[in-house]
């Protein structure tokens, strides 16, 4: 059965450049290994932001990526992207792959539009 991936349509990053959003898939398959990839879509181009593989024992992901973190629980991944600036505003897609055991399944969310507003610089104080 096909997996459907859902994620919020819009998220506003914090003033510190941090955006958090869930990525969920259904139906929940009995899977030992789930790979989650965050992609950024600009025009017709897609670029990988970060990727990780979750297992029953390894539920904290993206350890190789300084700007991404995430936790996995059942069929839900809570994603956090940090270090965002206004130029990073865009559509971020969550791709979920059920890697093991076979069969392989893949699904992609419709994307989360992350809006990032750079904080105003502090005025000089006399």
């Amino acid at each position: 059965e096909a997996i459907q991936v859902t994620q919020p349509s819009v998220v506003l990053a914090s003033s510190h450049g941090v955006a958090s959003f869930p990525c969920e898939y259904s139906p929940s398959h009995n899977t030992d290994e789930v790979r989650v990839t965050v992609l950024r879509q600009t025009n017709d181009q897609m670029t990988e932001v970060c990727a990780t593989t979750f297992t029953e024992k390894n539920t904290v992901g993206f350890l190789d990526y300084p700007f991404c973190s995430g936790t996995f629980n059942e069929s839900r991944v809570n994603l956090t992207i940090q270090g965002l600036r206004a130029v990073d505003t865009g559509l971020y897609l969550c791709k979920v792959e059920l890697m093991y055991p076979p069969p392989y399944f893949v699904g992609m969310g419709n994307g989360t539009q992350i809006y990032v507003i750079d904080p105003e610089p502090c005025p000089d104080s006399d």
């Epitope: 096909a2 997996i3 991936v5 076979p102 069969p103 392989y104 893949v106 699904g107």
Partner: antibody, heavy 119, light 108 residues
Framework: QVQLVESGGGVVQPGRSLRLSCAAS????????MHWVRQAPGKGLEWVAV????????YYVDSVKGRFTISRDNSNNTLYLQMNSLRAEDTAVYYC????????????WGQGTLVTVSS | EIVLTQSPGTLSLSPGEGATLSCRAS???????LAWYQQKPGQAPRLLIY???SRATGIPDRFSGSGSGTDFTLTISRLEPEDFAVYYC?????????FGPGTKVDIK
């Protein structure tokens, strides 16, 4: 430019073995999933197997499970298909193909190598 | 296993005419993970469309893909002489990654 060159095909008797190779160049081989797809004479395309970029995950079509093994050598940019217990119905042109980075469709293909299983 | 059915089996048309090729899946798969390929005799297949509707690099805009769920369509707006070939659809949403049986587009 991306190039995939298969080799190792030939005529083999039923029950015997054969190993196909696919030499890849023009891209970062270790970043892509790689597939074998076959085509029997005058017939359509049949996906055979895939191996993920790091070699950890492999999937096969049911008809070759337990007989064929896909593997890769990322240091030599080479993909392999070990075919054991060959049957007449395995006769086909075997293509290696690159799985596109964002989904397992095939953006580059080799020219194919013909495997004929006959007594 | 997802079974793909293509229709018609053969399409006989003249250059300049439009062609509509259908691909139907036995069950739905995720995110429109469907591709179309063109194959000419003695050659390897060539990717035309992925993601049901995105044209691959270098593919002319007379080729377009559409559809979702279980029903997909490849449209060739005006057939050029080099377009006469066999066309295959393929799903890559779940393993095994199956192909349809193909539609042959030949010259009337």
């Amino acid at each position: 430019q991306v190039q995939l060159v298969e080799s190792g095909g030939g005529v083999v008797q039923p029950g015997r073995s054969l190993r196909l190779s696919c030499a890849a160049s023009g891209f970062t081989f270790s970043s892509f999933g790689m597939h074998w797809v076959r085509q029997a004479p005058g017939k359509g395309l049949e996906w055979v197997a895939v191996i993920w970029y790091d070699g950890r995950n492999k999937y096969y079509v049911d008809s070759v499970k337990g007989r064929f093994t896909i593997s890769r050598d990322n240091s030599n940019n080479t993909l392999y298909l070990q075919m054991n217990s060959l049957r007449a119905e395995d006769t086909a042109v075997y293509y290696c193909a690159r799985g596109e980075f964002f989904g397992e469709f095939f953006d580059y293909w080799g020219q194919g190598t013909l495997v004929t299983v006959s007594s | 296993e997802i079974v793909l059915t293509q229709s018609p089996g053969t399409l006989s048309l003249s250059p300049g005419e439009g062609a509509t090729l259908s691909c139907r899946a036995s069950q739905s798969f995720s995110s429109n993970y469907l591709a179309w390929y063109q194959q000419k005799p003695g050659q390897a297949p060539r990717l035309l469309i992925y993601g049901a509707s995105s044209r691959a690099t270098g593919i002319p805009d007379r080729f377009s893909g559409s559809g979702s769920g279980t029903d997909f369509t490849l449209t060739i707006s005006r057939l050029e002489p080099e377009d006469f070939a066999v066309y295959y659809c393929q799903q890559y949403g779940t393993s095994p990654f199956t192909f349809g049986p193909g539609t042959k587009v030949d010259i009337k």
